[in-house]
């Protein structure tokens, strides 16, 4: 006869694992009792249990309630068990030694695997600037065994750098992705992703990249110059910029207060029907926590009247 | 052949402790199998408990959490520790040694020594 096992048995942590033993003899042959033993090197072998064909299973106190036999119906020629919860602690080399009659006594050894499935983690990096030069954006560090794998899933152009900490019976992995800040990648997923033999599918871990910034700013309402005569309504000057963490405006005039019955709406400037006051330079100020822009424009209000004689007096010259 | 000699039984009070030891001798194989067995008056004979040479054990659940067996492999020595014993662990108490045989396994059993549980 002969015994038909496994090389590696492999289980995830926590699952039971089945450590197969089966005795194909030839007819009329019986099996007397399985005896299985944990037989690492270096270490005498320490027995786990047996199963005796006459008064059943009997289990080592270092193992009990965590070996059993297979769920009915049992072939008596299968000395195979179940390692309830696997742990860690029970990664190794096992023997199982099959005790005949009439043959005599067969052994064989497989190695029992446990997969630590990773629990991923991921840490942002300092706060993103425009403007800095290559910086961390994130770290993503996953401990299992066998090691996993850690890569980066992005459509943001970047470096990463990865590096390995092993230890007794695990190894952590830390992949780190670095990039040079630009507003463009405000709102863009970094995405790490941990693969494992333990685990069904990748974990997925996402982090939100946000980069501050303040663009420049410019002022928009003055386009045409000759719309700012005396008695318009409803002229408005708007200051242009964007930026994060969303920017404050502030509005003041260069030479003086801000006239009276002009409002400050925001980003907005609003004038009352218009006055020759209403002349001067206004400053738009824009600002963030990470920094500030100034844009200045002149108003100049026409007086239709002062035009109109020029184009008189133009008329008459010629 | 095989020779199982027990001894430690005796009159003990409900709640108390007794101790239990067959020493073997003769012809012991290396996958021997040694335990104790019970036998109350009018009552089958029954399993208490065994244990493998590796250490390995198997109990009886009317035993578990109160009996622990054990054994000398060096002095081919078998030991039941009975404790919290009730009134109905009265019984006599027969070690078995179990040995290969043919095709099968083959029981050797002691004379037996009884034990008496008072309540």
């Known amino acids: 006869g002969e015994l038909e096992t496994s090389d590696v048995v492999t289980v995830v942590l926590g699952q039971d694992a089945k450590l197969p033993c089966f005795y194909r003899g030839d007819s009329g042959e019986q099996v007397g009792q399985v005896a299985w033993a944990r037989v690492d090197a270096g270490e005498g072998a320490q027995e786990l249990a047996l199963l005796h064909s006459k008064y059943g299973l009997h289990v080592s106190p270092a193992y009990e309630g965590r070996v059993e036999q297979p769920p009915p119906p049992r072939n008596p020629l299968d000395g195979s068990v179940l390692l309830r919860n696997a742990v860690q602690a029970d990664e190794g080399e096992y023997e199982c030694r099959v005790s005949t009659f009439p043959a005599g006594s067969f052994q064989a050894r497989l190695r029992l695997r446990v997969l630590v499935p990773p629990l991923p983690s991921l840490n942002p990096g300092p706060a993103l600037e425009e403007g800095q030069g290559l910086t961390l954006a994130a770290s993503c560090t996953a401990e299992g065994s066998p090691a996993p794998s850690v890569t980066w899933d992005t459509e943001v152009k970047g470096t990463t750098s990865s590096r390995s900490f092993k230890h007794s019976r695990s190894a952590a992995v830390t992949s780190e992705f670095h990039l040079v800040p630009s507003r463009s990648m405000n709102g863009q997923p970094l995405t790490c992703v941990v693969s494992h033999p333990g685990l069904l599918q990748d974990q997925r871990i996402t982090h939100i990249l946000h980069v501050s910034f303040l663009a420049e700013a410019s002022v928009r309402g003055l386009e045409d110059q000759n719309l700012w005569h005396i008695g318009r309504e409803g002229a408005m000057l708007k200051c242009l910029s964007e930026g994060q963490p969303p920017p404050s405006y502030n509005w003041t005039r260069l030479d003086g207060p801000l006239p009276s019955g002009v409002r400050v709406d925001g980003d907005t400037l609003g004038f009352p029907p218009l006055t020759t006051e209403h002349s001067g330079i206004y400053v738009c100020h824009v600002s963030n926590e990470f920094s500030s822009r100034d844009s200045q424009v002149t108003v100049d209000v026409l007086d239709p009247q002062e035009d109109s004689g020029k184009q008189v007096d133009l008329v008459s010259a010629s | 052949e095989v020779q199982l000699v027990e001894s430690g039984g005796g009159l003990v009070q409900a709640g108390g402790s007794l101790r239990l030891s067959c020493a073997a001798s003769?012809?012991?194989?290396?996958?021997?199998?040694m335990g104790w067995h019970r036998q109350a008056p009018g009552k089958q004979r029954e399993l208490v408990a065994t244990?493998?040479?590796?250490?390995?054990?198997n109990y009886a659940d009317s035993v578990k959490g109160r009996f622990t067996i054990s054994r000398d492999n060096g002095k081919n020595t078998v030991y039941l520790q009975m404790n919290s014993l009730k009134p109905e662990d009265t019984a006599a108490y027969y070690c078995?040694?179990?040995?290969?045989?043919?095709?099968?396994?083959?029981?050797?059993w002691g004379q037996g020594t009884q034990v008496t549980v008072s309540s």
């Open positions: 003769g012809s012991i194989s290396s996958i021997n199998l």
């Open positions: 244990i493998t040479r590796g250490g390995s054990t």
């Open positions: 078995v040694d179990v040995e290969p045989s043919g095709m099968g396994w083959r029981d050797y």
